[in-house]
Amino acid sequence: SASSRRRQQSRNRSTQSQDVARVSSASDYNSSELKTACRKHELYVSFQDLGWQDWIIAPKGYAANYCDGECSFPLNAHMNATNHAIVQTLVHLMNPEYVPKPCCAPTKLNAISVLYFDDNSNVILKKYRNMVVRACGCH
Amino acid sequence: SASSRRRQQSRNRSTQSQDVARVSSASDYNSSELKTACRKHELYVSFQDLGWQDWIIAPKGYAANYCDGECSFPLNAHMNATNHAIVQTLVHLMNPEYVPKPCCAPTKLNAISVLYFDDNSNVILKKYRNMVVRACGCH
């Protein structure tokens, strides 16, 4: 029907109209080229580098990883975007001064076990939750 | 004991050493003033503004809200930070060129029910998950 065609056009417009030329902003990023899309980056963290070597016995460090990258329109399936992030992306395109892009954050985190000295010099084995990034997404 | 004193000093150092003067970065935000800490901001989204008024029957819009603000050292209890975010904050302080700060993202999201026309002009009532930000945190 005409109304369903109109609705379909409207849905298309809501995506097509956002396929805009990227505008440079005075941002942290060199605006002459796009930043890569949100993804997991590898990062090994040494407890000595953090200054924790005197109280953490083992491990010496661990693969913490981190999330970084753009959550720009259009958010594709690899970006594990929530419905809210999809809405926020559209709002950001229309009101970039007021609403930021969604951010690239961990979607899956794993624990690690740490052997350490407590304040009384007892040796403790403890599982620390949410220490390792396994996957990232736009939130 | 001396070893436990050394461990305590080491723990203190890992925080004290980060109490550095804030340096401006060439960011999207006016760097002459500090950005506020990560928190929930209110945002009403009108489906008409998104161009979805022809297929969404009700509601006309909803309180989507969004997360924004700094996830800077030290991350306090209000910031709902994960263990990974705490580690990443320290790594960022020591290697800001390589590792970003954790980002301010939703920690609690709610659903909303939407009445809409599908592609065949049927009226559908559907619950859309993760549409409303209820709380934010550093991730």
Epitope: N30, D49 | Q16, S17, V23, P96, E97
Partner: antibody
Framework: QVQLVQSGAEVKKPGASVKVSCKAT????????FHWVRQAPGQRFEWMGW????????EYSQKFQDRVTITRDTSATTVYMELNSLKSEDTAMYFC???????????WGQGTLVTVSS | EIVLTQSPGTLSLSPGERATLSCRAS???????LAWYQQKPGQAPRLLVY???KRATAIPDRFSGSGSGTDFILTINRLEPEDFAVYYC?????????FGRGTKVEIK
């Protein structure tokens, strides 16, 4: 071998701008961050800012925030530092330096002397 | 901002002698992030020591670093003629990256 080669000496008038280049060879350019540091006569080294050439992230010292711009050209494996609104106090030797993750400034350019004089 | 104070300002020694250079920080920081550089007139600084005590590539073993907390030392055993230069300490554990004023090691 790792080399950072900077552009030649410059003489500028107060109020003018200067753009110094730093050409990197002998390593994978895009996996490093580069810093700019200056050394005025009789003064300590002064850190100006950095750029991560892989993603373009950059940060400037509060002191130079309004006057300095650090950029890079990945195809030319070159980093640039532009300083505007020059004053006589900006007369100094300007150095680029490479910094690896967790590391110190392990390699430096030979320096570029910028003289600001009317 | 971590302020680094180097002493003495000038050290007058003869070849073969030992030089002991001091660098004191305004606040405690991990020794992981303390470096020493050597600079000769008209040249760029050269990395000698990082992590307070690790020698950089191709640096002779007469150079050694030590210290932690706020007090750091660079020792040059048996000074060679080419060691007469200015030495700087640096904090590289995040911005702002800061340097000491330097210690000049000159021939007596």
């Amino acid at each position: 071998q790792v080399q950072l080669v900077q552009s030649g000496a410059e003489v500028k008038k107060p109020g003018a701008s200067v753009k110094v280049s730093c050409k990197a060879t002998g390593f994978t350019f895009i996996t490093y961050a580069f810093h700019w540091v200056r050394q005025a006569p009789g003064q300590r080294f002064e850190w100006m800012g950095w750029i991560n050439v892989g993603n373009g992230n950059r940060e400037y010292s509060q002191k130079f925030q309004d006057r300095v711009t650090i950029t890079r050209d990945t195809s030319a494996t070159t980093v640039y530092m532009e300083l505007n609104s020059l004053k006589s106090e900006d007369t100094a030797m300007y150095f680029c330096a490479r910094r690896p993750l967790w590391g110190p400034f392990d390699y430096w350019g030979q320096g570029t002397l910028v003289t600001v004089s009317s | 901002e971590i302020v680094l104070t180097q002493s003495p300002g000038t050290l007058s020694l003869s070849p073969g002698e030992r030089a002991t250079l001091s660098c004191r920080a305004s606040q405690i920081f991990s020794n992981t992030f303390l470096a020493w550089y050597q600079q000769k007139p008209g040249q760029a600084p050269r990395l000698l020591v990082y992590g307070a005590s690790k020698r950089a590539t191709a640096i002779p073993d007469r150079f050694s670093g030590s210290g932690s907390g706020t007090d750091f030392i660079l020792t040059i055993n048996r000074l060679e003629p080419e060691d007469f230069a200015v030495y700087y300490c640096q904090h590289y554990g995040g911005s702002p990256w800061t340097f000491g004023r330097g210690t000049k090691v000159e021939i007596k």
